[in-house]
Amino acid sequence: KEEQISFRDCAEVFKSGHTTNGIYTLTFPNSTEEIKAYCDMEAGGGGWTIIQRREDGSVDFQRTWKEYKVGFGNPSGEYWLGNEFVSQLTNQQRYVLKIHLKDWEGNEAYSLYEHFYLSSEELNYRIHLKGLTGTAGKISSISQPGNDFSTKDGDNDKCICKCSQMLTGGWWFDACGPSNLNGMYYPQRQNTNKFNGIKWYYWKGSGYSLKATTMMIRPADF
């Protein structure tokens, strides 16, 4: 009987010879549970597992804790891969996180963190980041040290307010902090002076809602 080959991430898919962009089935570490993810096999050497994408506002990102845990959306379009899978994956080995951003004026930028992982659900999927480089700001737009993840039904921010309810979307809110890539999608010419848009403050400044975002991870030793 032929053994079923399973892949933990898109880097393993790439190294197995699958070098075409697309949706691949990945397997949770130390488990048979599967998840579908989009793999970017072209950008920066390939092997990137896409954990978030915004591009057209077709998917509602104001979701529950459980939905952010297991993932939602369509891997070929707008989606969130799932906090549980990303947490398990990034605690197996060292991963880098690249965040690619597009504004409405045709500009692109990125932030690259040389070490990224999420704590377990018991610790509210707190984000841990080290070593920022890139063109989307010299200061991290994800507050440091990292915060717990918050959703509309899971308020773990550092604010007496409820950041997720006001800003919409699940995110690692501070009080409320300089970013939220899961905010409301605003079309061009309606994307300025918005407090609840798709924000990356240290690139675009105050109240600017972005056109497109992608969050992707890859093993540091790829």
Partner: nanobody, 123 residues
Amino acid sequence: EVQLVESGGGLVQVGDSLRLSCAASGRTFSTYLMVGWFRQAPGKEREFAAGIWSSGDTAYADSVRGRFTISRDNAKNTVYLQMNSLKTEDTAVYYCAGSYDGNYYIPGFYKDWGQGTLVTVSS
């Protein structure tokens, strides 16, 4: 162009009350994530005093909690700061500011600012 205009400052005695007003033109306050009152005493840094979120929730600095109250009148597009039991250390220029981003207590995240109104508390 957005203009925030503060009023209501003046010279008062210790223990007195004042109500500051911040009126906005060119934008409604509901478009901001947070409208904050900051104050700057002579020779000191500008510091957060009180703020009100779009949701209506409020926040206060420890130094003013229980004495100051922030409120909003959407119909008049005005935010107020009611200041009771004033102390000499409350003497400062008080600024109204509007923010779309960031942490509410950090002045650098506020985009629109008024010119300020002076409050002097004498003994």
